[in-house]
Amino acid sequence: SGTTNTVAAYNLTWKSTNFKTILEWEPKPINQVYTVQISTKSGDWKSKCFYTADTECDLTDEIVKDVKQTYLARVFSYPAGHVESTGSTEEPPYENSPEFTPYLETNLGQPTIQSFEQVGTKVNVTVQDEWTLVRRNDTFLSLRDVFGKDLIYTLYYWKSSSSGKKTAKTNTNEFLIDVDKGENYCFSVQAVIPSRRTANRKSTDSPVECMGHEKGESREI
């Protein structure tokens, strides 16, 4: 069944990083357009991306209202040029997305080392806190604001002159590590949510930053 000459969407997929959330689907439309609806389990359907010829819809504005809710979306197919009144009492064909819980499923974006500072044999490494589109009281929240202590960072560091890596962990955005005096070190960080048991538990590694370059500051004491 369904509206004449329209094909139901398929392969509905959530793509989400740091809560920026896009629903993607197939097929590329031929003589048809799409409208997306999104709902929470306790809410109701809201229409988005009306009569679009795209095969994606940015649903960030909806999911950031409550990132711990579970969302369901569906994509309706309409014949192009006949979206308002097809003269048919048939509902357009549609397909449901998988359920999506942003807090549990959004991917962690690649972190960035903001700075490092050496004081004697200690180095303080600071991870840049990424801003999200999640709001509280009209203020955008950082990744740390949203995840709190559920989010940790792992620091990988090694002497520039060798390949043996050491690791450190923090549930803040700062590390204080011991280093050998007179040695240059390189650093990379990774965001991790240990409570997750899925592939999206870890981010990709940050770009490598090495001492002796402009990001850091060294003070011999």
Epitope: D44, W45, K46, K65
Partner: antibody, heavy 118, light 107 residues
Framework: QVQLVQSGAEVKQPGASVKVSCKAS????????MHWVRQAPGQGLEWMGM????????TYAQKFQGRVTLTVDTSTSTAYMELSSLRSEDTAVYYC???????????WGQGTLVTVSS | DIQETQSPSSLSASVGDRVTITCRAS??????LNWYQQKPGKAPKLLIY???RLQSGVPSRFSGSGSGTDYTLTISSLQPEDFATYYC?????????FGQGTKVEIK
């Protein structure tokens, strides 16, 4: 416990407007949608529309589009349904109902009888 | 819009009887089918949601089944307090629509 308390009965002239209120308590008002359903005397139930109190997003049944306006006042946890250009066939009991999922009306107000008569 | 056709429109039964009410939708509503009970002068009360899930506090003699376009409400052993009007309602797609109702009367 969840409670929806509606305003009292109204008698209106044809062509007038009526505004029915629904005060919610016992839950976080902005978390759940509010629906409005009416029932003419001796007749069945008819869905009029719904509103998301978190952002005032509304969806109306086409039959009522342009005549019904749903609003909320989050400071008092109150939903409102205003119906304009009243005619005799709008005589009905009007219910607010709290949503608990897509198209699901788990809690209902006691109803407000609106009588349209000249 | 999706239409619901309920049958029968009324029925007479005795206490202890097994009662079945059916609801047919004009198209597949993917199990988004709810049942309500209404007594005279009162607001409707949710009994069953999503075809077969019993609302909290509703006696287990009420049950629901079905799929696609055809759905059923069953009262396994009718009790005196069950004499009322029953409505099915599709929650698959706005505008949400109700069946015309089934009045269950005492035989």
């Amino acid at each position: 416990q969840v409670q929806l308390v509606q305003s009292g009965a109204e008698v209106k002239q044809p062509g007038a407007s009526v505004k029915v209120s629904c005060k919610a308590s016992g839950y976080t008002f902005t978390t759940y949608w509010m629906h409005w359903v009416r029932q003419a005397p001796g007749q069945g139930l008819e869905w009029m529309g719904m509103i998301d109190p978190s952002d005032s997003y509304t969806t109306y049944a086409q039959k009522f589009q342009g005549r019904v306006t749903l609003t909320v006042d989050t400071s008092t946890s109150t939903a409102y349904m205003e119906l304009s250009s009243l005619r005799s066939e709008d005589t009905a009991v009007y219910y607010c109902a709290r949503g608990s999922g897509p198209g699901l009306f788990a809690y209902w107000g006691q109803g407000t009888l609106v009588t349209v008569s000249s | 819009d999706i239409q619901e056709t309920q049958s029968p429109s009324s029925l007479s039964a005795s206490v202890g009887d097994r009662v079945t009410i059916t609801c047919r939708a004009s198209q597949d509503i993917r199990n988004y089918l709810n049942w309500y009970q209404q007594k005279p002068g009162k607001a409707p009360k949710l009994l069953i949601y999503h075809t077969s899930r019993l609302q909290s506090g509703v006696p287990s003699r009420f049950s629901g089944s079905g799929s696609g376009t055809d759905y059923t409400l069953t009262i396994s052993s009718l009790q005196p307090e069950d004499f009322a009007t029953y409505y099915c309602q599709q929650g698959n797609m706005p505008p949400y629509t109700f069946g015309q109702g089934t009045k269950v009367e005492i035989k």
